[in-house]
């Protein structure tokens, strides 16, 4: 494979976060080459001496893959020709967090870029009215978080109000002994108001909104990854 080693090509990565137990993507793009057989993709992880993944001559070459990644990686083979070297990581583990290098060799030269990959657990919260309680109460539940997040309540009517005195948050360890279920209860809820339950750790921020009126209940949730352009 004859490259001079003197020319450099542009390689671009994007910091991202992986949700433990689910599949994740490590994003990497590069200046494409005309021939697939001339492209080599190598994914490396800081402190790991074996390769995370290697793709060359149009197919995966996994003989040098490190044990901790065996059977868990794949590139998007049909997109390599257009400059996509992104890596799919199956069943994300807490220990997958770290700095990765996307290293590319083509007939034009070689290049690399690093990316920070965070791992944790994050999930959408669901806010419901707790009809079993003695007073009007809201219950915010999110099934999987790690590391332990903070939970803050807010309301549209009482903007800036501190609800810590009238709320109670608990964290229950899930069966796999890493992630936790988050349950937060807000008391003394008034009608015709929109309440927000905001759950946040250093990886993600999720919000569950509930609007309670005489005639209906409206819910909305959204989740945003932090320190990530993904």
């Amino acid at each position: 494979f004859g490259i001079s080693g003197r020319h450099s090509i542009t390689v671009t990565t994007v910091a991202s976060a992986g949700n433990i137990g689910e599949d994740g993507i490590l994003s990497c793009t590069f200046e494409p080459d005309i021939k697939l057989s001339d492209i080599v993709i190598q994914w490396l992880k800081e402190g790991v001496l074996g390769l995370v993944h290697e793709f060359k001559e149009g197919k995966d070459e996994l003989s040098e893959q490190d044990e901790m990644f065996r059977g868990r990686t794949a590139v998007f083979a049909d997109q390599v020709i257009v400059g996509n070297a992104s890596l799919r990581l199956k069943n994300v583990q807490l220990t997958d967090a770290g700095t990765y290098k996307c290293y590319i060799i083509t007939s034009k030269g070689k290049g690399n870029a690093n990316l920070e990959y965070k791992t944790g657990a994050f999930s959408m919260p669901e806010v419901n009215v707790d009809y079993n309680a003695s007073s009007e109460t809201l219950r915010c539940e999110a099934p999987r978080w790690f590391p332990q997040p903070t939970v803050v309540w807010a309301s549209q009517v009482d903007q800036g109000a501190n609800f810590s005195e009238v709320s109670n948050t608990s964290f229950e360890l899930n069966s796999e002994n890493v992630t936790m279920k988050v349950v937060s209860v807000l008391y003394n809820v008034t009608i015709n108001n929109t309440y927000s339950c905001m759950i946040e750790n250093d990886i993600a921020k999720a919000t569950g909104d509930i609007k309670v009126t005489e005639s209906e209940i409206k819910r909305r949730s959204h989740l945003q990854l932090l320190n990530s352009k993904a």
């Epitope: 494979f1 080693g5 080599v40 190598q42 490396l44 992880k45 800081e46 402190g47 790991v48 001496l49 074996g50 003989s63 040098e64 490190d66 044990e67 901790m68 220990t95 700095t99 290098k101 290293y103 060799i105 070689k110």
Partner: antibody, heavy 121, light 107 residues
Framework: EVQLLESGGGLVQPGGSLRLSCAAS????????MHWVRQAPGKGLEWVSA????????YYADSVKGRFTISRDISKNTLYLQMNSLRAEDTAVYYC??????????????WGQGTTVTVSS | DIQMTQSPSSLSASVGDRVTITCRAS??????LAWYQQKPGKAPKLLIY???TLQSGVPSRFSGSGSGTDFTLTISSLQPEDFATYYC?????????FGGGTKVEIK
Amino acid sequence: EVQLLESGGGLVQPGGSLRLSCAASGFTFNTHAMHWVRQAPGKGLEWVSAISGSGGSTYYADSVKGRFTISRDISKNTLYLQMNSLRAEDTAVYYCARLLGRFGEYGMDVWGQGTTVTVSS
Amino acid sequence: DIQMTQSPSSLSASVGDRVTITCRASRSIYTWLAWYQQKPGKAPKLLIYDASTLQSGVPSRFSGSGSGTDFTLTISSLQPEDFATYYCQQSYSTPYTFGGGTKVEIK
């Protein structure tokens, strides 16, 4: 100053054990993979073992697999090589070395002075 | 395992000579190759990494080239302190392997 200092070598009988230590100073120990390399008298260099920065991954040459164990104590900035079931062919100067760069694709840029292990009855 | 074959095993040269040492890998290692210098009773010293990158503090008379399976270490003008044994080493695949060494002696 970046430095590695090995100790623990000596004379041991075949079948015996030794533990080599390598004290690191002058750099952030837990961000570098570390290696043990040996050199038998009058011979070339032979890679023996390596450990990742976190200590979570270890690697061995076939000639020592199952007999040698590499480990690191980040709190003490020290690398270890536990050598069991020693053989005459393990006689060598043992060097610890730091991996240059963060990803394993470069060479070993800092070496200790070496410690001598002699296996003989 | 990847075999690293170095040649020649020894050579005699004079101060000021241009010296070339070659290293061949049994299969492609891209540019995952380092060159070391070792003097008697001393630890090896890193000269070149990534096949062609000069390690900090190493004189510019040393240079490395090659990729894939064939690599070269060149000393453009041999100096008295350069008489030593030189080793190549691949870090593409564990077990990492060294070449057998090339002893550069005074003619």
